[in-house]
Amino acid sequence: SERCDDWGLDTMRQIQVFEDEPARIKCPLFEHFLKFNYSTAHSAGLTLIWYWTRQDRDLEEPINFRLPENRISKEKDVLWFRPTLLNDTGNYTCMLRNTTYCSKVAFPLEVVQKDSCFNSPMKLPVHKLYIEYGIQRITCPNVDGYFPSSVKPTITWYMGCYKIQNFNNVIPEGMNLSFLIALISNNGNYTCVVTYPENGRTFHLTRTLTVKVVGSPKNAVPPVIHSPNDHVVYEKEPGEELLIPCTVYFSFLMDSRNEVWWTIDGKKPDDITIDVTINESISHSRTEDETRTQILSIKKVTSEDLKRSYVCHARSAKGEVAKAAKVKQKVPAPRYTVELACGFGAT
């Protein structure tokens, strides 16, 4: 066969679906690789072909579209499973071609088992809710296109293993789940089970997501530098190690980049001819407020280093702050035998 533009195995789209549930998988060519859509391709005389490689096999084989009850079918650029089976796991390829053109991409599909409490190896999306922020909603994800708008499915929501009924501040409202006032106690995994009829059969879609309650923008503040501060003086003798921690608190802010950096004499440490190392550690509170600590260290400090200006800077979407460390050369204590003894009239 003639050459085909092969986009390889698209591991970025590691698709996971639950066993014994419907799954609709769009060919990624039109979403991420080609500049035209399926309709344009189809009307230009291009054909979409599907095939797969079973798990732990090397052999590419055509997909069997002649299974009972049309268990696997293709509709436009979508591959349908009604429902999936565990051994559907493998690498799937969609190829778009005619006599003069060919393009293909493969992607992994994993069919996953779940237990009665919806626990599974499925990677869960995380939805962040602001603490004590008023009514916020989550929506049952990835259910579009499974049934027509004329079909009215039943939706049941669970927190962990428990059906959500008569919960204090969590109210199921069809495809949405409303949190009247989100609290830390609302952290956890929430599952919606969507049940709908199709051709005399009943199908279930299970979607689980993790809810994480985070700091509210109402309470967000610019970064706060706890250290260095005006109360601590770093007094050192030449030759000693100088260690200055910069500890900064950042309020949680959605999509904010938190930055901490040191300047020495107004310059980046890399631009100063001293042997300085900086180590960073990061910790998070329960509401994902962040504390970053950057420790600046100079193994053997010189008297020149003790005159330098050491400033810790911090920046978030809320603003920029800076604080200088007070660094001093230690005044050597008097040597008793000489200085003090002379004071007592010794000769």
Epitope: T263, D271, K307, S309, V311, A324
Partner: antibody
Framework: EVQLQQSGAELVKPGASVRLSCTSS????????MHWVKQRTEQGLEWVGR????????QYAPNFQDKATITVDTSSNTVYLQLSSLTSEDTAVYYC??????????????WGQGTLVTVSP | DIQMTQTTSSLSASLGDRVTISCRAS??????LNWYQQKPDGTVKLLIY???TLHSGVPSRFSGSGSGTDYSLTISNLEPEDIATYYC?????????FGSGTKLEIK
């Protein structure tokens, strides 16, 4: 509040010396390097030098090595700039200033009001 | 010494205008550049340090940018109190040096 109060204008004769003062308040002078700059009429700023009040160590721009002497009296929170062998070229406004942060910070945030030195026979 | 050149010695603009003042270094100064404002009465203020960091209390209409040898100070919406002379200052190499200043006047 950080304040730098400079001494009044000086009219001096060529060949003489002059000592300008800059008295600080609102901070501990020993924590910050103190600097001086020169500004001639309708011209830019020229860095003269600086002193570390902690130990009196000074550093000067090459052009001012033999012209300027910076000293400090920490008991009165005052920095001095002495200019010697004055010529008409030394006629200028001299500013003292303090950096934003401790030590050798290059961000010059707090400035005195300036002292005009006029060298005239 | 590093030479700092402010080619425009004076600039006339109308209130509300966006004004850009430029400064060129005789060699790469790695963003180690500050901007100062000197009012007609001689008062000097730090506006921006390290090319683009606004000093506290400075209005957000002031901004700085640049890299290598070319830097600029922008006032986005000129106000009457912005009438002053603006100086750039490099601290990349000793001794620190300043530009000759750009005097901003109202049309």
């Amino acid at each position: 509040e950080v304040q730098l109060q400079q001494s009044g204008a000086e009219l001096v004769k060529p060949g003489a010396s002059v000592r300008l003062s800059c008295t600080s308040s609102g901070f501990n002078i020993k924590d910050y390097f103190m600097h001086w700059v020169k500004q001639r009429t309708e011209q830019g700023l020229e860095w003269v030098g600086r002193i570390d009040p902690e130990d009196g160590e000074t550093q000067y721009a090459p052009n001012f090595q033999d012209k300027a002497t910076i000293t400090v009296d920490t008991s009165s929170n005052t920095v001095y700039l002495q200019l010697s062998s004055l010529t008409s070229e030394d006629t200028a406004v001299y500013y003292c200033f303090r950096p934003l942060y401790y030590g050798n910070s290059p961000w010059f945030a707090y400035w005195g009001q300036g002292t005009l030195v006029t060298v005239s026979p | 010494d590093i030479q700092m050149t402010q080619t425009t010695s004076s600039l006339s603009a109308s209130l509300g205008d966006r004004v850009t003042i430029s400064c060129r270094a005789s060699q790469d100064i790695s963003n180690y550049l500050n901007w100062y404002q000197q009012k007609p009465d001689g008062t000097v203020k730090l506006l921006i340090y390290y090319t683009s960091t606004l000093h506290s209390g400075v209005p957000s209409r002031f901004s700085g940018s640049g890299s290598g040898t070319d830097y600029s100070l922008t006032i986005s919406n000129l106000e009457p109190e912005d009438i002053a002379t603006y100086y750039c200052h490099q601290y990349s190499k000793f001794p620190p040096t300043f530009g000759s200043g750009t005097k901003l006047e109202i049309k």
